[in-house]
């Protein structure tokens, strides 16, 4: 198992928009109708003012207006609930679809896209109803931007919640080569398909994607738990052809000062179609972006049961070196290299300030309330609440595959 | 090496009840979704019931919907299948399969229980 | 829902003999660039065993002999030089579009 690595199953909290655990003051919009439907009426299943935020321009055909969610601390976000306008129950305004921006630093803004590369959601069918989606991927963010949409001029109107847990990893990005497509009886695509940063000549910087989305994969690498996605998804890989330096190098940076006990690399080991897991990791550390780097590089081996073609999670100890960016070499010992998840064991130095985009001021962890109950969706059939952290007898809901 | 060991099958009268359950190893459970696939005496296979790797997605064909119910216990690595209103065409040999949710089908399966719904 | 239906319901094939096996959907199973077609070997009194996954990907531990085609509608299971084990029934199955069918299976046997 992946000690430290976050599970999706048991962040699915309410965040706070529903219960006010998120202040008037975190939740903002583009413009408002009216200062009874102001960006503050945009609760889940609440009936403050006229019922909704309700913009003051036409989304037809700008797509410009939205609702701003700032949740102070980087989140993972995994799924959006939307509404219409109550209005005491005579409100006719909803928005059949949407799309989602996010941002971690409130300065650079990412579209959200589903798996497909599709960033248009559908919305709700009717004002009261409460439509649940479910982010595949999910975001990691700080501030979260609701963009109704409309295929002609009318009213749209919105109350929303999101759902999710406190981003405890405190990674803001990773670099890494831009994974490749193995060629078997049809092409595997081992490239981070979700990655949400940049790309220049064959590198990928400044972001997070598949390495950090919670998602492990499968034994056989050609197979994923996710419907409908294309042979390799749940895996970034590269071939040892195109490293003549013999190993993959990565850089990670982190929201503040840590020492570091572990790295969780989860690696695909199907040697009889060339992946194999790394010979060794030698990782670097330092403590802000222009440093040197500090000491000498922490370096692992890999020994255990090679043959052995499961997939697993191999623990590099990083000794508790603190930095706030490390750097780690993956040697290759077969063909191929293939991962699909990367995380940490480490704990704050304290003391340390927030790095720009990283963390902010004190919030709680933990699920700031209950969920909602009873919501209809498009693209889901609920069976009771929406989600909450997975236990036994919470709900579970039907999914149309179609 | 994977194993799927399906329980609780027998005889019920129409309109009754049962509960399966899939007792799983030799694979990490919660990385996989899980299904249930019936055989009925004529052969013809149906899928019956589809779950996601953490439990909170579910499937059902419209021939069952309302009266099974999918679940799963991570921590017990067990699957299970409740089962109400029986019908007579609902007898079949049930197995138990990991997969479905997925893009590859359903890879390992279970060697199956017999229900018999009859008065 | 989509239909399968595969062909011929029974074959009888010499040891040492190809044998193939199709399935036609009633409409197309591809998404995304890929066909969500799979293919099951059951032998008598035991479970369904997966063969071939997504038309053409071979599965772990299975020989060589076993191979899968096509595209969209038209899918093909082919066994090169068959063997006194491959006698079973054939299944086809699209995981494209709920509710996932299966096919009404061929039944394989040694002429």
């Known amino acids: 198992d992946m000690k430290g690595h976050f599970d999706p199953a048991k962040c699915r909290y309410a965040l706070g928009m529903q219960d006010r655990t998120i202040p008037d003051s975190d939740i903002s919009a583009s413009s408002s109708w009216s200062d009874s439907t102001a960006a503050r009426h945009s609760r889940l299943e609440s009936s403050d003012g006229d019922g909704a935020w309700c913009p003051a321009g036409s989304v037809f055909p700008k797509e410009e207006e939205y609702l701003q969610v700032d949740l102070q601390r980087l989140h993972l976000v995994a799924l959006v609930g939307t509404q219409g306008r109550h209005a005491g129950g005579l409100g006719k305004e909803f928005s059949r679809s949407y799309r989602l921006r996010y941002s971690r630093d409130g300065r650079r803004w990412m579209g959200w896209k589903d798996r497909w590369g599709q960033e248009v959601i559908s919305g709700n069918e009717d004002p009261e109803g409460v439509v649940l989606k479910d982010l595949g991927p999910p975001m990691v963010a700080r501030l979260v931007r609701f963009y109704p949409r409309a295929d002609r001029v009318m009213s749209v109107c919105l109350r929303v919640e999101l759902y999710g847990c406190l981003w405890r990893d405190g990674l803001l990005s990773y670099t890494a080569p831009v994974g490749q497509t193995m060629y078997l009886s049809e092409a595997v695509y081992l490239n981070d398909s979700t990655y949400d940063g940049h790309t220049v000549g064959g590198l990928q910087y400044g972001g997070l994607g598949q390495l950090a989305d919670g998602v492990v994969g499968l034994d056989d690498f050609r197979k994923s738990q996710e419907l409908r996605v294309w042979p390799g998804y749940d895996y970034v890989g590269w071939s040892n052809h195109s490293f003549s330096s013999g190993y993959v190098e990565m850089e990670f940076e982190f929201d503040r000062l840590r020492a570091f006990q572990a790295m969780q690399v989860h690696c695909n080991n199907m040697h009889t179609l060339g992946a194999r897991l790394p010979g060794g990791v030698e990782c670097r550390f330092r403590r802000g972006p222009a440093m040197a780097w500090e000491g000498e590089p922490m370096r692992h081996n890999l020994g255990g049961n090679l043959g052995d073609p499961r997939a697993r999670a191999v623990s590099v100890p990083l000794g508790g070196r603190v930095a706030r960016f490390l750097q780690c070499r993956f040697l290759f010992a077969g063909p191929w290299l293939l991962f699909s998840e990367i995380s940490f064991i480490s704990d704050v130095v304290n003391n340390s300030s927030p790095a720009l985009g990283g963390t902010f001021p004190p919030a709680p962890w933990w699920p700031p309330g209950p969920p909602p109950t009873n919501f209809s969706s498009l693209e889901l059939e609920p069976r009771g609440q929406q989600p909450v952290a997975k236990a036994e007898g919470s709900p579970t809901i039907e999914f149309r595959m179609d | 090496e994977v194993q799927l060991v399906e329980s609780g099958g027998g005889l019920v009268q129409p309109g009754g009840s049962l509960k399966f359950s899939c007792a799983a190893s030799g694979f990490t459970f919660s990385s996989y979704g899980m299904s249930w696939v019936r055989q009925t005496p004529d052969k013809r296979l149906e899928l019956v019931a589809i779950i996601n790797s953490h439990g909170f997605s579910t499937y059902y064909p419209d021939s069952v919907k309302g009266r099974f119910t999918i679940s799963r216990d991570n921590a017990k690595n067990t699957l299970y299948l409740q089962m109400s209103s029986l019908k007579s065409e609902d007898t079949a040999i049930y197995y138990c399969?990991?997969?479905?949710?997925?893009?590859?089908?359903?890879?390992?399966w279970g060697q199956g229980t017999s229900v018999t719904v009859s008065s | 829902d989509i239909v399968l239906t595969q062909s011929p319901a029974s074959l009888a094939v010499s040891l040492g003999q190809r044998a193939t096996i199709s399935c036609r959907a009633s409409e197309s199973v591809d998404s995304y660039g890929n066909s969500f077609m799979h293919w099951y070997q059951q032998k008598v009194g035991q479970p369904p065993k997966l063969l071939i996954f997504r038309a053409s990907n071979i599965e772990s531990g299975i020989p060589a002999r076993f191979s899968g085609s096509g595209s969209r509608t038209d899918f093909t299971l082919t066994i090169n030089s068959v063997e006194a084990d491959d006698v079973a029934t054939y299944y086809c199955?699209?995981?494209?579009?709920?509710?996932?069918?299966f096919g009404g299976g061929t039944k394989l046997e040694i002429k």
């Open positions: 399969a990991r997969g479905g949710y997925g893009n590859y089908g359903m890879d390992y």
């Open positions: 199955q699209q995981s494209n579009e709920a509710p996932y069918t």
